[in-house]
């Protein structure tokens, strides 16, 4: 025998208390597929969350984060504070990237500058807290007359110009 609940479309639930009729989902609840025996409570985007898409009888609400925060986790399950470029979020708040590291986004951690010498290249542009170094041609490519690129002054590798 076919389950009578299988006839209940999205936006309804199979109400066992009422002879398995397909009752519409009550306000603030939804069912995104047919044959459901309950409707799920709509997600509420409160506090640091804001509503990106309203709930309906057939689909849950979707949240994103208020300005100054960004989403983390599946379906934006958490909001994390933004930092400035050149910073990372620690337990004590936003902190500048340590020397030799950078962050070019408002989220995430500071990452080490690229070590150009590992690829046999030289530093073309020094790194900053906000930007990675730019590696240039290898020193062997810089034989006299072979290139118009002026090699950087010998500095620590990777290089960092004083802020």
């Amino acid at each position: 025998l076919q389950d009578p609940c299988s006839n209940c479309p999205a936006g309804t639930f199979c109400d066992n208390n009422r002879n398995q009729i397909c009752s519409p989902c009550p306000p603030n609840s939804f069912s995104s597929a047919g044959g459901q025996r309950t409707c799920d409570i709509c997600r509420q985007c409160k506090g640091v969350f804001r509503t990106r898409k309203e709930c309906s009888s057939t689909s849950n609400a979707e949240c994103d984060c208020t300005p100054g925060f960004h989403c983390l986790g599946a379906g934006c399950s958490m909001c994390e504070q933004d930092c400035k470029q050149g910073q990372e979020l620690t337990k004590k708040g936003c902190k500048d990237c340590c020397f030799g590291t950078f962050n070019d986004q408002k989220r995430g951690i500071c990452r080490p500058w690229t070590n150009c010498s590992l690829d046999g290249k030289s530093v073309l542009v020094n790194g900053t807290k906000e930007r990675d170094v730019v590696c240039g041609p290898s020193p062997a490519d810089l034989s006299p007359g072979a290139s118009s690129v002026t090699p950087p002054a010998p500095a620590r590798e990777p290089g960092h110009s004083p802020q």
């Epitope: 006839n7 209940c8 479309p9 999205a10 936006g11 309804t12 109400d15 009422r18 009729i21 397909c22 009752s23 519409p24 989902c25 009550p26 306000p27 309906s56 009888s57 057939t58």
Partner: antibody, heavy 122, light 109 residues
């Protein structure tokens, strides 16, 4: 403009049939918006006739007194809902309203047509 | 079947009065109740849904309360445009689940 417009009312003899139409404009019936029929006899209160699921399924919700005489149907391509009334009696004389029952308004009737008068008399 | 009983069936009041109308369901309908206002020759207008939520554009002098079987519509300070008939309706969907109350006519004292 968001509105419901009923048509098809008029004078009909006892035992006769009539089909009322309700055309929706400015929105589409969906799982969030169910079309319903309500009637009001002269000088009397509101009486719920029934509703139909607004999406593609043909689930209907009806007042028990309508069974076998009144049938609600829908044509999604025309965004129109119908009330087929058979075996009409003098006591079916009333203004028939089409209403939109909305999930967003706790399934209350948040939009109503102007009504169409049905008179059953010989 | 769900039956909805309203009281009183009619009342006379003056502008500025506080008016209370009650509605009783024959079985529990949680908070699934709507209130409407209807003026002669016009379609009903939704005032309150989910027992206590004010519909869009409805003045704040209207309020609703209750849950289960007993519900109340209150007009805190009656205005000239509020003289009308008021209906409750169960929105507890299902066959015979959306019955209207018997109506309350509010007239000038």
């Amino acid at each position: 403009e968001v509105q419901l417009v009923e048509s098809g009312g008029g004078l009909v003899q006892p035992g006769g049939s009539l089909r009322l139409s309700c055309a929706a404009s400015g929105f589409s019936f969906s799982a969030n918006y169910y079309p319903c029929w309500v009637r009001q006899a002269p000088g009397k209160g509101l009486e719920w006739i029934g509703c139909i699921y607004g999406g593609s399924s043909d689930i209907t919700y009806d007042a028990n007194w309508t069974k076998g005489r009144f049938t609600i149907s829908r044509d999604n391509s025309k965004n129109t809902v119908y009330l087929q009334m058979n075996s009409l009696r003098a006591e079916d004389t009333a203004v028939y309203y089409c209403a939109r029952s909305a999930w967003y308004s706790g399934w209350g009737g948040d939009l109503w047509g102007q009504g169409t008068l049905v008179t059953v008399s010989s | 079947d769900i039956q909805m009983t309203q009281s009183p069936s009619s009342l006379s009041a003056s502008v500025g009065d506080r008016v209370t109308i009650t509605c009783q369901a024959s079985q529990s309908i949680s908070n699934r109740l709507a209130w409407y206002q209807q003026k002669p020759g016009k379609a009903p207008k939704l005032l309150i849904y989910s027992a206590s939520t004010l519909a869009s554009g409805v003045p704040s002098r209207f309020s609703g309360s209750g849950s289960g079987t007993d519900f109340t519509l209150t007009i805190s300070s009656l205005q000239p445009e509020d003289f009308a008939t008021y209906y409750c309706q169960s929105t507890y969907y299902g066959n015979d689940g959306n019955a209207f109350g018997t109506g309350t006519k509010v007239t000038v004292k």
